[in-house]
Amino acid sequence: NFMYSKTVKRLSKLQEYQQYYPSLTCVMEGKDMEDWSCCPTPWTSFQSSCYFISTVMQSWTKSQNNCSVMGADLVVINTKEEQDFITQNLKINSAYFLGLSDPKGWRHWQWVDQTPYNKNVTFWHSGEPNSPDERCAIINFRSEEWGWNDVHCHVPQKSICKMKKIYI
């Protein structure tokens, strides 16, 4: 009876999410493997988040709006492990917008989700950021490693969206 009511709840939750995400990929987790954590297909998952790499070339503001429509934000990178996971799926000759910007050019960087900007957990390439006119951050491959660079926000780039996993 307990399992039946849990399944019914899950199905109704799935139906609820289906209007936003036509397909979800779910895995069982939790100590009794009773919880399902899901990401929209074909997003990838890492820890408690889902990631989507957009190959559409758009300005930073348009990229953020595009993520927002999908219930996400441009990616906020909190750890080196998270960055290493993300970069596995990136092309080394491309650049991708992050959810990091400095709209006034005062070198006051801010994450789109209001996560505090911690200078100790940043992965800028050597010599970056280097221009107050370049107010948006990308991740790209340079000098044999992935790192961040400040660029003009209006110049179209690919982008990475991030959202919290859906638990059902």
């Epitope: 300005s59 503001t61 050019g105 221009s131 006119d133 926000c153």
Partner: antibody, heavy 121, light 111 residues
Amino acid sequence: EVQLVESGGGLVKPGGSLRLSCAASGFTFRSYGMSWVRQAPGKRLEWVSTISSGDSYTYYPDSVKGRFTISRDNAKNSLYLQMNSLRAEDTAVYYCARQIYYDYAYYFDFWGQGTTVTVSS
Amino acid sequence: DIVLTQSPDSLAVSLGERATINCRASESVSFRTSHLMHWYQQKPGQPPKLLIYGASNLESGVPDRFSGSGSGTDFTLTISSLQAEDVAVYFCQQSIEDPPTFGGGTKVEIK
């Protein structure tokens, strides 16, 4: 006082080339992105190209891509536009303009007086 | 590309009266509190001159009879009390994404 002075315009046959120059004074030229904007008779203003302050970024609309090249010489406080394979539709007054960044975008705060390019056989 | 449509194409206003020019973008040129539309004035035989940046910020040296407002896709330039020297063509411009684009212009004349 900020000044932008364009030169190099003139009459050229279709398929020909011209090099426009813009001499800048009254400001620290190397610190600013610069653009060329044109205005054909009776038409709206049309952006032609942009170059970033550090020369790392250039951008063109499809209408001129592959034919026009923007460049700058910060030592000479000069901006250039090399125009090849010119067409009748390139006929316009060409302005050089200084860019000022504002939040996620930019505007043009100073414009030169313009130089006229006429493409005709 | 973002298309900017200005209205009206031309406007005749009596001296001392209010002139209102509209600019509509084909998609939003705002992001959160940033409204990325700018306005220019162009007199015959002269280059454009910046009046308003960021939808509502008056450029230094521009008389305060000029003002701007709007957000998203709809923006307005207002001349509160038209003076003879305001006879010109007025353009809006966006640069939230490349390529930057301009409106078709509104010609302001004296009635």
